[in-house]
């Protein structure tokens, strides 16, 4: 840009140097040159001379008009054509910006990752504003009425040390730029309800050599939360559809989960957990790939055969990835195992 230019005159912008994208804009240039009665005044945008919509107002001043200006940034300067001078003479320059007022922040979510010592709040910022936009996060205790504010650009981490006064808070976010301000909806937060258990990790898997081979997946977490509900999803690497198994877990010991899988196939497993009865999930764990052993007998493989069904009651769901680029956005077709056949349930989003 041209923020430190020595002007021999003035340049100003109506409605202002930062304005709403798509507005009509007038830029004025007024010369105050010594020993020059300019024949012409010229405007340049980003170094290129402008040809249209220029009006000479009087001897010293000219205006250029833009209909529906839609560039996020431009630098403007103007020059004079002085008699007897070979080159144009610089008068002044200005950086101009256009943008949008912020959208109201949406989908405000606050979680405490176990052992992190922080409450992390995130939100959707909406459409790009193209100009400097700040987010002010308000955290108000519902017990003491004390309010704290934090400045953020896209998310905020608030030390739980500064949230010692109470357990219940009201959280909201203001989006602010020079074109406007919008508030998110307020979020009621109880600190005990937003803890996400420490990461769950699949440590190993093995397939037994039994008549009906089974795969045992071992997984663990360092969580101190006693009641944890988990999901493990799995599929062959060639498949788009996930199956999901649900578990109540107690991480005082390593978890073992049994699966009856197709032989000689490469499977990928992932696990995620939440505190039982709460709504915030861990992200899915890193994919764990396991190759099942080759079939030794001649038994025909039936994915819904009885050995699978004869485990303790559980729900297995089938989940189809919408696209390989969005592994976390899934559509889930719940299917409860009953008499060896899948029974379709409702779609729900687990992404």
């Amino acid at each position: 840009g041209i923020t430190s230019i020595n002007c021999s005159g003035d340049m100003w912008v109506e409605p202002g140097e930062i304005f709403q994208m798509g507005m009509n804009v007038s830029i004025y240039c007024q010369e105050a040159l010594k020993h020059c009665r300019p024949r012409n005044l010229y405007f340049y945008k980003n170094g290129f001379k402008e040809e249209f919509d220029i009006t000479r107002i009087n001897r010293t001043t000219a205006r250029i008009w833009y209909k529906g200006f839609s560039e996020p940034h431009a630098y403007m300067h103007c020059t004079a054509e002085c008699p007897g001078h070979f080159q144009e003479t610089l008068i002044c320059g200005k950086d101009i910006s256009s943008g949008h007022p912020p959208d109201a922040p949406s989908n405000l979510t606050c979680v405490i990752y176990e052992y992190s010592g922080n409450m992390t709040c995130t939100w959707n910022t909406g459409k790009p504003t193209y100009i400097d936009t700040k987010y002010i996060v308000h955290v108000k205790s519902l017990e003491t009425e004390e309010e704290q504010q934090y400045l953020a650009s896209s998310y905020v981490k608030i030390s739980t040390d500064s949230l010692q006064g109470s357990r219940k808070y009201l959280v909201w976010v203001q989006a602010v730029n020079s074109l406007g301000m919008e508030n998110s909806q307020q979020l009621h937060v109880h600190l005990d309800d937003i803890v996400i258990p420490s990461a769950s990790i699949i440590s190993r898997a093995e397939t037994t050599n039994d008549t009906v081979p089974k795969t045992i997946v071992y997984w663990k977490s360092k969580t101190m939360i006693e009641k944890v509900f988990c999901e493990m999803r799995y599929k062959t690497t060639t498949n788009q559809t996930w199956s999901v198994k649900e578990f109540d877990a107690n991480f005082t010991y390593v978890q073992q989960s049994e699966f009856y899988l197709e032989p000689d196939s490469k499977y990928v497993f992932q696990v995620r957990c939440q505190e039982t009865g709460k709504r915030n999930w861990q992200p899915w764990s890193s994919p764990f790939v396991h190759q099942t052993s080759q079939e030794t007998g001649k038994r025909n493989w039936q994915p819904w055969s009885s050995p699978f069904v004869h485990q303790t009651s559980q729900t297995v769901s089938q989940v189809t990835a919408k696209s390989s680029h969005e592994p976390q956005k899934m559509e889930m077709l719940s299917a409860t195992i009953f008499r060896g056949h899948p029974a379709s349930g409702n779609h729900q989003d687990i992404g």
Epitope: I18, D132, Q148, Y150, S162, S178
Partner: nanobody, 116 residues
Framework: QVQLQESGGGSVQAGGSLRLSCAAS????????MGWYRQAPGKERDLVSM???????FYADSVKGRFTFSQENAKNTVYLQMNNLKPEDTAMYYC??????????WGQGTQVTVSS
Amino acid sequence: QVQLQESGGGSVQAGGSLRLSCAASGDTYSSCTMGWYRQAPGKERDLVSMLMGDGSTFYADSVKGRFTFSQENAKNTVYLQMNNLKPEDTAMYYCGCATLGSRTIWGQGTQVTVSS
């Protein structure tokens, strides 16, 4: 840690003017996003004006065209020129230093009372 001290408040008739000052001390002032806030009794502390990183200034709709935010870097001081004051501008006015990810630091505040 930044310390902030406001001054310039007082009582004024509707239509009058006041100029608030906020002097900052401390070595992290340069990283502050400075703002003026106000809090009426029983209400939240609301943002009135803030200096943005691109050199522009935010003004709340209720004060646009009447209030002007300025700063004097050499003195580590910011100002809020308030013209055409209205009774609804009555509040405690605070300046604040906000840095990304940190809790906003406030001054002690200065009272502005506008009578009709």
